[in-house]
């Protein structure tokens, strides 16, 4: 019998230092580019190899970014969110939401999958 798929949602503060090639990730989302249905939030779509985010190791593809340097990312156009990151300075604080897939099988069997966005 197959168990149902649930999600464990956690939040984390990630402090990145901008590297020679920047922060090293891509985003999707925004009020004009909804990536998740009925959610205009900003999501990490790519972590670039050897970039600042990849070297730090905590930010994951599929994470939702809630704020940048304390500034909320709710209800932003996609390009406005991009510009916010580009102008965020050398030290960048990200509040992120990780979504971990949890497979709930028969009693006593609980496995964890990869984060999914």
């Amino acid at each position: 019998m197959n168990g149902r798929v649930d999600y464990l949602v956690t939040e984390e503060e990630i402090n990145l230092t901008r590297g020679p090639s920047g922060l090293g990730f891509n985003i999707v989302g925004g009020t004009d580019q909804q990536y998740v249905s009925n959610d205009s939030g900003i999501y990490v779509s790519r972590i670039k190899e050897n970039g600042a985010a990849a070297l730090d190791g905590r930010l994951q593809e599929g994470d939702k970014i809630l704020s940048v340097n304390g500034q909320d990312l709710k209800n932003l156009l996609h390009q406005d969110a991009v510009d916010l990151f580009r102008n965020a300075g050398y030290a960048v604080s990200l509040r992120v939401q990780h979504r971990l897939q949890v497979q709930n099988g028969p009693i006593g069997h609980r496995g964890e999958g990869d984060p999914s966005g």
């Epitope: 920047g22 891509n26 390009q79």
Partner: nanobody, 128 residues
């Protein structure tokens, strides 16, 4: 981690057609930029065609324009390369590639235009 499995390669006569498919799994397909690359005997791997995550932007190698068409089906987590009017010089191993799409938070101009993070094993196309 993204897993990519190509299919549809084979032996075809010059002027014929093939349709390559690449099935992706491991993360939401709808956020992935996808590409087809090829490696001809004794040559470097070249980009053939790419399609962005939203499906509204494509790129083609000059020598395949008008003959090859890249498309995607997000419901099936699959990208296709329709190859018509095949020529002997199209003989190569064809690779599917993927990367997260979207906008770089770093620069308007991203130097890694054809940098992809995930690769399939390749499928052989031979045009006689």
């Amino acid at each position: 981690e993204v897993q990519l499995v190509e299919s549809g390669g084979g032996l075809v006569q010059a002027g014929g057609s093939l349709r390559l498919s690449c099935a992706a799994s491991g993360r939401p397909f709808s956020s992935l930029d996808m590409g087809w690359f090829r490696q001809r005997p004794g040559k470097e791997r070249d980009v053939v065609a790419t399609i962005n995550w939203t499906g509204d932007s494509t790129y083609y190698l000059d020598s395949v324009k008008g003959r090859f068409t890249i498309s995607r089906d997000n419901a099936k987590n699959t990208v296709f390369l329709q190859m018509n009017s095949l020529k002997p010089e199209d003989t190569a191993v064809y690779y599917c590639a993927a990367r997260g799409g979207g906008s770089s938070v770093d620069s308007e101009y991203d130097a890694g235009e054809f940098e992809y993070d995930y690769w399939g094993q390749g499928t052989q196309v031979t045009v006689s």
